[in-house]
């Protein structure tokens, strides 16, 4: 090899790099050395390139032509085929033609950002150049033709289209199976249709932030089964529904901050089982409902700062067993910390909770129950006045506690806090000064002498009358009463909550009077009126009484709205035969749902019940008695009962039975002159009619024959020989006839035979 060629006159050299940037060049330097691998021609005044200038550059791989005045993709002559990276950003290129790129057989990186390109046609990027990274950001692209990038399907890994004017993406716009990063942020996209991104099998990062997306159609991200990160910040989304997330099975991070999302739908997350980080900051959320994120069992970081969350239902975080970081800064969840317990249940792995700037005035004893593993708690930016005894005690792993408040009420109830903080070495991030009493104003709680933490008065309101659990009939008026006392003359405000949410248009009556026992103490009463109650009024009611020193929360009183039961089905009288099945119907409505109970003849211990022949079918309001017996006959009562009262309806069960003998009719032998009785004791329903026969004929009665009124007993007196014969008892009712027979034998009158034996 000959001696190394010198550096070009207008340039500087370092290794195999030639830097001709920022020299005001209008044309290529003529003496480019052949050893050049990297050529920097940026920040010049080049409006066109002479391909001949690149004839003798066999090692050229990297060309920087950014910040010039080129209007088209230049040809680099013979060097085109081995250039790997071509930087053309910040020129005046208006379009890209496939013919301009055909010669770049080795091109892997092409930067066309910050030019004047207005459209991308499917002729722009031909098959050939193995481009891996294509940057078209900061152009004026409004149209993306279907298949515009198909020519790059075998090579393209990163595509940047940010800061353009794209308003719409065609369905299946990209057939780029190797693409891992797609950047579409800062465009004008309004809608993502289903299957828009199908064909991007390898995509890992999709950036759609700062568009105007208001709707994600079902299946919007279908096909992105390898995607890890989705950016949708700064759009106009109002909700995240389940269908739109369908197919995002590998998603790790979802960025949705700075939208207008007002509600989290529980079912929205079932397709994102691997989600680790969910960012919903700067939205319009006002509440977190129970189990609204329960599907996200792998979620590690949840950011909900800068919303308007004022209500966190108990169990709102249920299912988030892997969550480590929960950011709730700048919301309005004071009530959750001041009163509720259980809001954070389910967060077994949480190590960091931030609640900065939530207007929290006090910390309730059980506010953080369920967060025993917490290591970092930020309560800064809250004008905290009081912390209930032992509020943080169960957090054995707490390493950092942030409190910054100059509003502390330094009374006997706060005395525990300074030693506890110091004992746990948590005072480093606690700036806590007293506002009251006046003698301690401005003093750090850590410097206040123990004897100064005294309760000479009760500035914060104290509940003296709690609202009481009550039951009301639909349509009635009811009222809840709540009273509190305070030694402060600070203005008092009243609020009522139903199921932990403030009632905005509550019908309230408030008044104040001086407490009789102590002229210094004011008693404040608030009455909540509920007019013509409906089922919608049911719930747990609580009053919140607030003054400058804090809020006091009453017990929660339950209102149950009742409706007296009324029958929708009543039992009817029935008549049936024995051994068959009796069926009685009974159903009732009411609120709460009434319970149905059955009785027979006023009691619950009856044959069908005892013998397990009674069956109640709760789903179809039917009462059955199987294998009906005569004893089952009677009056059955159906009683429908709820907390409002009870009603009853009766039905008579009549049991029909074919006639039968209770006692068998036996043959008899009597002597002349004696009296004989034949009993035909029959049962049956209706009671059978009994007729006596002698032989085949109805019995002829004489003065010697006597029948009881029901014909069940036949008495024959002074029996004569002619009375002998076959007697038949015939028992008949509407169900049938039964017969029984008795052979009557008559012996001669009693006397002595010649042989000495007795007759009769």
């Amino acid at each position: 090899a000959g001696p190394r060629a010198p550096c070009a006159a207008a340039c500087t050299c370092a290794g195999d790099s030639l830097d001709c940037g920022g020299r005001g060049l209008a044309a290529l330097p003529g003496d480019l050395p052949s050893w050049t691998r990297s050529l920097n021609l940026s920040y010049n005044k080049l409006s066109e390139i002479d391909p001949a200038g690149f004839e003798d550059l066999p090692n050229l791989q990297e060309v920087y032509l950014n910040n010039n005045e080129l209007t088209a993709v230049p040809s680099l002559g013979a060097a085109s085929s081995h250039v790997v990276s071509l930087f053309l950003q910040h020129n005046k290129i208006r379009s890209v033609e496939g013919s301009q790129l055909k010669a770049y057989l080795s091109l892997e990186v092409l930067d066309l950002s910050l030019n004047n390109i207005t459209e991308v046609r499917n002729t722009c990027f031909p098959h050939g150049p193995p481009i891996k990274e294509l940057n078209l950001a900061g152009n004026r692209i409004g149209t993306l033709e279907l298949g515009a990038f198909d020519g790059l399907s075998r090579s393209l890994l990163t595509l940047r289209l940010s800061k353009n004017r794209i308003t719409q993406l065609p369905v299946r716009a990209f057939k780029l199976p190797r693409l891992t990063q797609l950047d579409l942020n800062r465009n004008r996209i309004r809608l993502i249709e289903g299957l828009t991104f199908q064909g991007l099998n390898s995509l890992e990062v999709l950036k759609l932030q700062r568009n105007n997306i208001s709707k994600l159609t079902d299946g919007a991200f279908w096909g992105l089964s390898k995607m890890h990160v989705l950016h949708l910040e700064y759009n106009s989304l109002v909700e995240v529904n389940s269908g739109s997330l369908y197919g995002l099975t590998a998603l790790h991070q979802l960025h949705l901050s700075n939208n207008s999302i007002a509600r989290i739908h529980r079912k929205g997350w079932s397709f994102c089982q691997k989600l680790h980080e969910l960012v919903l900051s700067f939205n319009n959320l006002t509440r977190l409902d129970e189990e609204s994120l329960a599907e996200l069992s792998s979620l590690s970081v949840l950011r909900l700062s800068h919303n308007s969350i004022s209500h966190i239902a108990e169990g709102a975080f249920k299912g988030l067993r892997s969550l480590r970081v929960l950011d709730l800064d700048h919301n309005e969840i004071s009530g959750t910390i001041e009163d509720t317990s259980g809001a954070f249940s389910g967060l077994d792995s949480l190590s960091k909770l931030t609640l900065f700037g939530n207007k929290i005035k006090s910390v309730a004893k059980r506010a953080f129950s369920g967060l025993e593993g917490l290591e970092h708690l930020n309560l800064g930016g809250n004008a905290i006045r009081s912390v209930q005894f032992d509020a943080f005690v169960k957090m054995k792993n707490l390493k950092e506690l942030h409190i910054s408040s100059d509003s502390f009420l330094c009374d006997c109830q706060l005395k525990w806090l300074p030693p506890w903080l110091i004992g746990r070495m948590l005072q480093a991030f606690v700036t806590a000064t007293c506002a009251h009493p006046e003698s301690l104003k401005g003093q750090s709680i850590f410097s206040v002498p123990p004897e100064s933490f005294v309760c000479d008065d009760f500035l914060k309101p104290q509940i003296i009358t709690q609202p009481e659990t009550t039951m009301a009939m639909v349509g009635k008026d009811i009222r809840f009463t709540c009273s509190a006392a305070s030694s402060s003359s600070s203005p008092m405000t009243f609020a009522w909550k139903k199921d932990n949410e403030v009632l905005t248009n509550a019908d309230m009556e408030n008044f104040v009077h001086v407490h009789a026992q102590d002229g210094e103490v004011m008693e404040y009463t608030t009455i909540l009126h509920l007019r013509q109650v409906t089922f919608g009024h049911e719930g747990r009611y609580q009053c919140v009484i607030t003054n400058h020193f804090g809020s006091t929360y009453s017990h929660k009183a339950r209102l149950t709205v009742n409706v007296l039961p009324s029958f929708t089905k009543t039992p009817h009288d029935i008549t049936i035969r024995t051994t068959t099945m009796a069926r009685l119907e009974c159903a009732a409505t009411g609120h709460p749902n009434p319970q149905i109970a059955w009785q027979k003849d006023g009691g619950t211990d009856f044959p069908a019940a005892r013998e397990r022949r009674m069956h109640v079918m709760p789903d179809d309001d039917v009462f059955f008695i199987t294998d009906v017996k005569i004893d089952d006959a009677g009056v059955y009562s159906c009683t429908a009962q709820n907390s409002a009262g009870s009603i009853s309806a009766n039905a008579t069960l009549t049991v029909l039975e074919t006639p039968s003998l209770v006692v068998p009719l036996e043959d008899r032998v009597v002597s002349v002159g004696e009296t004989v009785a034949l009993q035909c004791k029959a049962t049956g329903n209706p009671p059978p009619r009994i007729t006596w026969f002698k032989g085949d004929r109805p019995l002829s009665l004489t003065e010697r024959h006597h029948l009881t009124p029901d014909n069940q007993l036949l008495v024959v007196q002074n029996v004569v020989a002619e009375d002998a014969g076959r007697y038949t008892c015939e028992m008949s009712n509407t169900l049938g006839t039964e017969r029984a027979h008795s052979q009557l034998s008559v012996l001669p009158a009693a006397g002595c035979r010649k042989d000495g034996t007795t007759v009769g």
Epitope: P419, I422, S439, Q443, S444, F446, S447, P449, P450, E451
Partner: antibody, heavy 117, light 107 residues
């Protein structure tokens, strides 16, 4: 670091007054309570009173009420304890101390006051 | 005033010994109990405050326990520099009051 430096030893006659100073450094003088404690020979330590320099509130042990006055000069970060109507049993080492959770975390080196005719 | 009764008034021990000093208050002092070490001609040095919190720079062989009216200072393994007089003091009410002291001497 926190330091409390007291004035030197004093010898006084019965009936006279003594004023002992305590200069604080290494912390915000107006944010902490300063106490005065004395130790007479062979006696247990005896608390005399405190001052909160931030608002110059004071509290005294009733035993010394009327004889002791504690003051502070915020600009000089210095507290003073003046004991009047001295008697021989007031002979003791007088300490200033800064409190933390009811305990005296930082002490001055002590000032011996001898009352003798 | 709350009376503080310290016992024993003196104890003789050897290096490495475990030493326990007790302090009883005449009424509940809500854990506001401090322990001091004092050497002749010096100001007392805070060892423990609020019953069991070790003041910065104090060796971990010193520990405190107790509640209500009864409190204990324990030196787990006596070192040569630990021979001194130890005082307890209640900080719950005014006036602050001190125990009579326990002198720990070399056996």
């Amino acid at each position: 670091q926190v330091q409390l430096v007291q004035s030197g030893a004093e010898v006084k006659k019965p009936g006279a007054s003594v004023k002992v100073s305590c200069k604080a450094s290494g912390y915000t003088f107006t944010s902490y309570y300063l106490h005065w404690v004395r130790q007479a020979p062979g006696q247990r330590l005896e608390w005399m009173g405190w001052i909160y320099p931030g608002n110059v509130n004071t509290k005294y042990n009733q035993k010394f009420q009327g004889r002791v006055t504690i003051t502070a000069d915020k600009s000089a970060s210095t507290a003073y304890m003046e004991l009047s109507s001295l008697r021989s049993e007031d002979t003791a080492v007088y300490f200033c101390a800064r409190e933390e959770l009811g305990g005296f975390a930082y002490w001055g080196q002590g000032t011996l006051v001898t009352v003798s005719s | 005033d709350i009376q503080m009764t310290q016992s024993p008034s003196s104890v003789s021990a050897s290096i490495g010994d475990r030493v326990t000093i007790t302090c009883r208050a005449s009424q509940d002092i809500s854990n506001y109990l401090s322990w001091y070490q004092q050497k002749p001609g010096k100001a007392p040095k805070l060892l423990i405050y609020y019953t069991s919190i070790l003041h910065s720079g104090v060796p971990s062989r010193f520990s405190g326990s107790g509640s209500g009216t009864d409190y204990t200072l324990t030196i787990s393994s006596l070192q040569p520099e630990d021979f001194a007089t130890y005082f307890c003091q209640q900080g719950n009410t005014l006036p602050r009051t001190f125990g009579g002291g326990t002198k720990v001497e070399i056996k």
